[in-house]
């Protein structure tokens, strides 16, 4: 008789992450009986959902149900219907909507309740939808980029306790950076976290982990750009702001209404006299690079150190994985070669601030111009954040790994947010047997 | 299973170009970078270039540059690579190989042979 | 671009022998950026090692990595009949990625 090939003993799950500029959906695949081991869940579909964030959706609710119509259509595509009723999706916001409800917490819940009555019309096991903290999102990112490297299996032969991997299970850190908040975890050596709110305590297959994390809510490129103009428009003479974070030749008008919209900007309001002002820009990185480091407040810390605004952070340590815009910006700029030193891409980055605007649109046709017109801002304020805010050195710089995925999936935190939703990191080692390591392809 | 499917030999002019590919099966391909190697025969293997099939961006050996332009079809998930001028140095066992963190190549095609000859 | 040199070019072992391949490398390398590969001939190359020292699927845990900074390793505990092959070791930390010009191991 002719074998036939056994139905595929497999789980899926859906993971949404609204961020502050756009909505991912993410369709994760595992195998059934594997639950518990490390590395087996991969991500097999990434949809972009068309459109802005969800936190931008505040006077127009009506419309979030068909903004998300396209993207959790196609995950009833990818996902087989018998498995459709089984499989979990949740929703995580981020920082664009930890900005709206600390504006109204009112216009936040609406928000959310029309995202999870849209979502819960789909013929999936529907899970809420909910904002997660700062310190989640560093700390899930954390754990998807370590749980995709491998680190957390203590890989031990089924014969033996003697570990086959020995110089590489040093976690790495994960640098994360959004459009409203950015993220920085890793597990410091043998230094005591002093404060509290930075610390986490995790224990994974067998192993206690004493991590640090913080989230620098207003430091994502988008909303640090709109802090760094309400900075510069305050000791403007005129209605023209001469900035060097563009390209020479580049010409914008911004709405004041727009730029005192977000609370992050709040510190620099004050009243102009106009309702418009003209980006002119200049193109002088070293120039940027001073603007964008009057944000960072390092004139206070109550700790044995700080990154900035008063914040802790320990010395740090290790490899550090930095992904979401981090790599976007920096692979745009084609700098995310372990081997290109800081020095190195400060000086590109010199020379690319300095092209004239018209033939940057030249060499990036295809790049739509709202996008083009920041990467000069991004890459120094990158720069200006790794360095000077959370203290990179030139030495250290070679310990920042540029990573967009690993084994095909994004970094980022939601994969570490299904894995802890659905139990699937334990807390112990699960006892492995000869067969147990054999792998899900 | 994850694979790289590669037509087995081209025999081309010298002049001529070629256009190579590489059907990619068993994941999605738009998650991982492609990859391009080259070896002589009885020689060791050198690295061509890659391309991100999720966005087009390609990185190449400046050995290459001129010779080698690599392109991918999403819909057919396939990825090519074009080698132009060709001459008989040309000749050679043309990998694609699918890239990962690290830039490892994990899975391999199993590789055409150019020939280069009148 | 960063040189890789594998030394010896060809090695004569036995069966049930240890053997260590070595790579130096011009600069510097992360650990995370170095890869080991078999090569048997008429076929193509196939992953042994990622990341210096994690052994990759299917791949019988007698192989093992090591290494940092510009010295690498890889051993195989008790060299088999089915090893013969050229092993190339293969750098990702800059470009262009490159690799060393193989180690042939042949049986005694």
């Known amino acids: 008789t002719q074998n036939k090939a056994l139905p595929e003993n497999v789980k899926y799950g859906i993971v949404l992450d609204a961020g502050s500029s756009h909505t991912s959906l993410y369709i994760y695949k595992w195998p059934a009986e594997k639950e518990n081991d490390t590395g087996v869940v991969h991500q097999v579909e990434e949809c972009r959902v068309k459109g802005p964030g969800i936190s931008k959706f505040v006077q127009k609710v009506n419309e979030i149900g068909i903004y998300l119509t396209d993207c959790m259509e196609r995950a009833r595509e990818v996902i087989p219907r018998s498995q459709h009723q089984e499989t979990p999706v949740y929703l995580g916001a981020t920082a664009g909507m930890r900005l709206l409800r600390m504006e109204s917490e009112e216009l936040a819940d609406r928000v959310l309740d029309v995202v999870e009555r849209s979502l819960s019309n789909y013929p999936f096991d529907f899970q809420g939808a909910r904002i997660i903290t700062g310190q989640e999102e560093g700390a899930y990112g954390w754990i998807t980029i370590n749980y995709l490297l491998g680190k957390f299996s203590q890989k031990t032969r089924w014969f033996s306790i003697v570990p086959y991997e020995t110089n590489n299970q040093e976690t790495f850190g994960a640098l994360d950076l959004g459009g409203a908040s950015t993220q920085v975890t890793f597990v410091p050596q043998n230094q005591t976290i002093e404060s509290p709110d930075n610390a986490l305590q995790f224990r994974l297959y067998g192993k206690d982990y004493n991590v640090y994390t913080h989230s620098f809510l207003c430091y994502g490129k988008d909303q640090a750009l709109w802090q760094k103009l309400a900075k510069d428009i305050q000791v403007a003479s005129n209605e023209i702001l001469r900035d060097p974070c563009f390209h020479p030749g580049y010409e914008a008008a911004v709405n004041v209404s727009d730029l005192y919209k977000t609370p992050c900007t709040k510190r620099f309001e004050m009243t102009l006299p106009f309702q418009q002002f003209r980006i002119q820009g200049i193109g002088n990185y070293q120039q940027c690079h001073q603007s964008i480091l009057e944000l960072f407040n390092t004139s206070y810390c109550p700790y044995s150190q700080c990154a900035f605004n008063g914040i802790f952070l320990p010395p740090l340590q290790g490899d550090f994985g930095a992904f979401s815009a981090f790599y976007f910006v920096m692979k745009f700029l084609n700098l995310t070669s372990e081997k290109v030193s800081q020095e190195k891409v400060t000086e590109m980055m010199k020379k690319f601030c300095a092209q004239p605007w018209e033939e940057i649109k030249t060499s990036y046709a295809g790049v739509k111009e709202k996008y083009l017109s920041e990467y000069c801002f991004s890459g120094t304020y990158i720069l200006s954040l790794l360095l000077q805010g959370y203290h990179f050195t030139a030495d250290s710089w070679e310990h920042i790994h540029f990573i967009g995925k690993i084994q095909g999936s994004d970094a980022g935190w939601t994969l570490g947010y299904m894995l802890n939703l659905t139990n699937m990191i334990p807390a112990e080692q699960p006892l492995s047997t000869p067969l147990s390591h054999s792998t899900y392809v | 299973p994850v694979q790289l499917q590669q037509p087995g030999a081209e025999v081309v002019m010298p002049g001529a170009s070629v256009k190579l590919s590489c059907k990619a099966s068993g994941y999605t391909f738009t998650s991982f970078w492609m990859n391009w190697m080259r070896q002589r025969p009885g020689q060791g293997l050198e690295w061509i270039g890659e391309i991100d099939p999720s966005d087009f961006y390609t990185n190449s050996n400046q050995r290459f540059k001129g010779k080698a332009t690599l392109t991918v079809d999403k819909s057919s998930s396939t990825a090519y690579m074009q080698l132009s001028s060709l001459t008989s140095e040309d000749s050679a066992v043309y990998f694609c190989?699918?890239?990962?963190?690290?830039?490892?190549?994990?899975?391999w095609g199993t590789g055409t042979s150019v020939t280069v000859s009148s | 671009e960063i040189v890789l040199t594998q030394s010896p070019t060809t090695m004569t072992s036995s069966p049930g022998e240890k053997i260590t391949f070595t790579c130096s490398a011009s600069s510097s390398i992360n650990s995370n950026y170095l890869h080991w590969y078999q090569q048997k001939p008429g076929f193509s190359p196939k992953l042994l090692i990622y990341r210096t020292s994690n052994l990759a699927s299917g791949v019988p845990t007698r192989f093992s990595g090591s290494g940092s900074g510009t010295s690498y390793s890889l051993t195989i505990g008790t060299m088999e009949a089915e090893d013969v092959a050229t092993y190339y070791c293969q750098q990702g930390s800059s470009l262009p990625r490159t690799f060393g010009g193989g180690t042939k191991l042949e049986i005694k």
């Open positions: 190989a699918r890239g990962d963190f690290g830039w490892y190549f994990d899975v």
